[in-house]
């Protein structure tokens, strides 16, 4: 009699994550009597995937009715494939007995799963840095397969070169992750700047996935201070202005000191934005010269975004 053959026609099958995979298997003979089982992997550690007689395999269904008389098709369909389903699947014929005895295995079908990378997530530094300092941004994307992937960084459309990228794991895996760090030199003009992490993969339909971060979250632009005196008014009052310019973020407290004593404290709020994203603020102080015998030392003290205070002083001359 002709020897029983277990035929798995496809050496390999590739599917997209989320789709269904059909693994084909036919036998050449109905005898000897005994069940067919599907396993992933070979040897003692193999994993039972489908057994018609018993067990609960919610994602696996038989393609044709295995209980039908003279059925020789034992193909299965696995639904909602994930990268974790990748591996080699074997259709195995058993001879009925107590227990059943393994008789013949098919050659195996390798299931390969292609999975899209997750949307890249870009994170910036935990604390703000000032212009002319370098800050690091990190981009992460997960769950893709195959391993080949390209990641590029851009700042305002220009590709960055100070980049370090790793794809993990280094060896064979069902899916992979990428992590990249870009070092960005900040300038005073970067409040409106943006960094983009762009990930391209074979599973994406020509359009890379993008993650973005705004440099406004990472930068601090310290203010310039200028104290000036307006001309003396007829009522012996002098108007002194403190101009605080080109600062970011808006969080700023200004204190006037007269001869070292606090005269007034103000908080910046609802300021109009400059074209470059920075802010300007002007504060005025009226000084009654006739109330002073000596020159008055006025100090404009600015505390910006929790940083140490910056002072600018000015002396108002009191003529004898």
């Amino acid at each position: 009699e002709e020897e029983l053959q277990v035929i798995q026609p496809e050496k390999s099958v590739s599917v997209a994550a989320g789709d269904s995979a059909t693994l084909n298997c036919t036998v050449s003979s109905l005898i000897p009597v005994g069940p067919i089982q599907w396993f992933r992997g070979a040897g003692p550690g193999r994993e039972l995937i489908y057994n018609l007689k018993e067990g609960h395999f919610p994602r696996v269904t038989a393609v044709s009715d295995p209980t039908k008389r003279n059925n020789m098709d034992f193909s299965i369909r696995i639904s909602n494939i994930t990268p974790a389903d990748a591996g080699t699947y074997y259709c195995v014929k058993f001879r009925k007995g107590s227990p059943d005895v393994e008789l013949k295995s098919g050659a195996g079908t390798e299931l390969s799963v292609r999975a899209k990378p997750s949307a890249p997530v870009v994170s910036g530094p935990a604390v703000r840095a000032t212009a002319e300092h370098t800050v690091s941004f990190t981009c992460e994307s997960h769950g893709f397969s195959p391993r080949d992937i390209t990641l590029k960084w851009f700042k305002n459309g220009n590709e960055l070169s100070d980049v370090q990228t790793n794809v993990d794991p280094a060896g064979k895996s069902v899916s992979y992750s990428i992590r990249s760090t870009a070092r960005v030199l900040l300038t005073r003009r970067d409040v409106h700047s943006q960094v983009i992490c762009e990930v391209a993969h074979v599973t994406l339909q020509g359009d890379p996935l993008r993650g973005t971060a705004n440099l406004s979250e990472a930068i601090r632009v310290p203010p310039f201070l200028e104290v000036t005196q307006q001309s003396m008014r007829a009522d012996n009052q002098v108007n002194v202005t403190c101009q605080v310019t080109k600062f970011y973020p808006q969080r700023l407290q200004l204190t006037w000191l007269e001869n070292g004593n606090v005269s007034r404290t103000e908080m910046a709020s609802a300021l109009p934005e400059n074209k470059d994203g920075t802010y300007n603020w002007t504060s005025w102080l009226l000084v009654n010269v006739s109330a002073h015998r000596d020159d008055v030392k006025l100090t404009c003290q600015v505390e910006h975004d929790g940083q140490p205070a910056v002072n600018k002083s000015f002396s108002v001359k009191v003529s004898a």
Epitope: S14, A16, D148, I149, T150, V202, G206, D207
Partner: antibody, heavy 116, light 109 residues
């Protein structure tokens, strides 16, 4: 699911020509589409692709001579200034459902002949 | 740009023969290689993708192997309808560009 090219004809050197690719059974907004050509008796040559969102990418030799664009149902290849070496059958094709590394649906082709 | 070198450029074989066509890439393309069959006056037809995966509806006598730079298309038992020209096509995941081999014409001996 199918694709079909149109617009191929006899054209004079230096004149423009636009070829179209009409798709049915799937959406152009879901797949990368490509243009290829084959000169008489020669092999296949890649021209360029357009991404699902409409971004075109070209083979390095194209050098601005061709422009790929699309509407909701058609993809176009604009040949800015025909040359005699552009005489070929032009094919459009769609990438496979698993990724952009292969093309599984091809049109029958449209013939462009450039001659004065 | 990546160059794809296909060999032989043509071959003569008989029905039932085992036929092997090779394709070599000028740099690694991992497994991003497809094989197409084209008959005169017709569009190419996809046979194999990802170097070794048989496209649906393609007879199992066609098989592909290889990765990196060296790839092979094998027809285990040549049938009358298999006389055609075969092309390999690469995709490079960094440049995201495609290149074809120059083709192999399989003729009747």
């Amino acid at each position: 699911q199918s694709v079909e090219e149109s617009g191929g004809r006899l054209g004079q050197p230096g004149t423009p020509l636009t070829l179209s690719c009409t798709v049915s059974g799937f959406s152009l907004s879901s797949y990368v589409m490509g243009w290829f050509r084959q000169a008489p008796g020669k092999g296949l040559e890649y021209i360029g692709i357009i991404s699902s969102s409409g971004s075109p990418y070209y083979a390095s030799w194209v050098n601005g001579r061709f422009t790929i664009s699309k509407t909701s149902t058609t993809m176009d290849l604009k040949m800015n200034s025909l040359r005699s070496e552009d005489t070929a059958t032009y094919f459009c094709a769609r990438v496979g459902p698993l990724g952009v590394d292969y093309f599984n649906i091809w049109g029958p082709g449209t013939l462009v002949t450039v001659s004065s | 740009d990546i160059q794809m070198t296909q060999s032989p450029s043509s071959l003569s074989a008989s029905v039932g023969d085992r036929v092997t066509i090779t394709c070599r890439a000028s740099q690694s393309i991992n497994s991003y290689l497809a094989w197409y069959q084209q008959k005169p006056g017709k569009a190419p037809k996809l046979l194999i993708y990802s170097a070794s995966f048989l496209y649906s509806g393609v007879p199992s006598r066609f098989s592909g192997s290889g990765s990196g730079t060296d790839f092979t298309l094998t027809i285990s038992s040549l049938q009358p309808e298999d006389f055609a020209t075969y092309y390999c096509q690469s995709w490079h995941y960094i440049s995201r560009s495609y290149t074809f081999g120059q083709g192999t014409k399989v003729e009747i001996k």
